[in-house]
């Protein structure tokens, strides 16, 4: 039994640098305890954004000084990672793991490529 | 960089019980799944345990289940097999290893401690 | 349980040839390693996710396979690869190994 992780394939970041997914997984177990780890690969280098875990029904719980915010309903997790510049543009990775009860399962999804762009500064302004 | 060192091992009888240490150094052991890998003399490979990340969660294999017990003291970043009611079966080397970023590959292994159960 | 099943048990090669080893499951496999064990060493990890190659491993090692059926190939075997290899399924506990496929000098 596979676990299936569905995930977009493209997010722009707004001008703020926040960026939005959702992540979804297709469990084939009854698990209670859901573990959300979001990996950011580029330049075939891969770094830990934020890692979550959290009781179904229950709210995910970050760390207090992660980027990364987010809600569950069901099988879908909405993931919000802010403080994002331009040379975070990478491929954001959503891999979950089914850790209780067993047995566990793994799934990683294909990744959802973020793109942000730095905003332009403004323009000092005559008065 | 990333370092696993197995002791604890040693011969013991039958029904006794033997407490295993994996001392990590180069990364903290909070982050990532660790578990124990046996090989009886001779033979394959056989996954033993897992504790993840927290701690508060351990699976284990089928045949050690209510024998072992896995615990970690965060402080000496040291990982403890506690193996009670131990059979001639458990004899093997136990290798202490780390599991990957992509997932429970193994990627770093200890050098193994042999734990011999014999009367 | 998913159970993995190498072969073939032992491979006899030359210095120099291709060695084509196999692992095939019992159920369906989402992620899968290869491993390299030699006599009196703990095992080393060659490959993961059935295709990526590990930190510092060459590039004569390569993997593949999806489903049921994996395969490791070493492309021109070097003296230091003659050792046992084992595959092993990762995507669900228990976290099961193949029996091991020793590739030894002919």
């Known amino acids: 039994k596979a676990m299936h992780v569905a995930q977009p394939a493209v997010v722009l970041a707004s001008s703020r640098g926040i960026a939005s997914f959702v992540c979804e997984y297709a469990s084939p177990g009854k698990a209670t305890e859901v573990r959300v780890t979001v990996l950011r690969q580029a330049d075939s280098q891969v770094t830990e954004v934020c890692a979550a875990t959290y009781m179904m029904g229950n709210e995910l719980t970050f760390l207090d000084d992660s980027i990364c915010t987010g809600t569950s309903s069901g099988n879908q997790v909405n993931l919000t990672i802010q403080g994002l510049r331009a040379m975070d543009t990478g491929l954001y990775i959503c891999k979950v793991e089914l850790m209780y009860p067993p047995p566990y399962y793994l799934g990683i999804g294909n990744g959802t490529q973020i793109y942000v762009i730095d905003p332009e500064p403004c323009p000092d302004s005559d008065f | 960089q990333v370092q696993l060192v197995e002791s604890g091992g040693g011969v013991v009888q039958p029904g006794r019980s033997l407490r295993l240490s994996c001392a990590a150094s180069?990364?903290?052991?909070?982050?990532?799944?660790m578990h124990w890998v046996r090989q009886a003399p001779g033979k394959g490979l056989e996954w033993v345990a897992v504790?993840?990340?927290?701690?508060?969660?351990?699976h284990y294999a089928d045949s050690v289940e209510g024998r072992f017990t896995l615990s970690r003291d965060n402080s000496k970043n040291t990982l403890y097999l506690q193996m009670n009611s131990l059979r001639a079966e458990d004899t093997a080397v136990y290798y202490c290893?780390?599991?990957?970023?992509?997932?429970?590959?193994?990627?770093?292994w200890g050098q193994g401690t042999l734990v011999t159960v014999s009367s | 349980e998913i159970v993995l099943t190498q072969s073939p048990g032992t491979l006899s090669l030359s210095p120099g040839e291709r060695a084509t080893l196999s692992c095939r499951a019992s159920?369906?496999?989402?992620?899968l390693a290869w491993y390299q064990q030699k006599p009196g060493q703990a095992p080393r990890l060659l490959i993961y996710?059935?295709?990526s190659r590990a930190t510092g491993i060459p590039d004569r090692f390569s993997g593949s396979g999806s489903g049921t059926d994996f395969t490791l190939t070493i492309s021109r075997l070097e003296p230091e690869d003659f050792a046992v290899y084992y595959c092993?399924?990762?995507?669900?506990?228990?976290?099961?190994f193949g029996q091991g496929t020793k590739v030894e000098i002919k």
């Open positions: 092993q399924q990762y995507g669900s506990s228990p976290w099961t």
């Open positions: 159920q369906s496999v989402s992620y």
């Open positions: 290893a780390r599991g990957g970023v992509w997932g429970s590959y193994f990627d770093y």
């Open positions: 180069g990364f903290t052991l909070s982050n990532y799944g």
């Open positions: 504790i993840w990340y927290d701690g508060r969660n351990k």
């Open positions: 996710g059935a295709s």
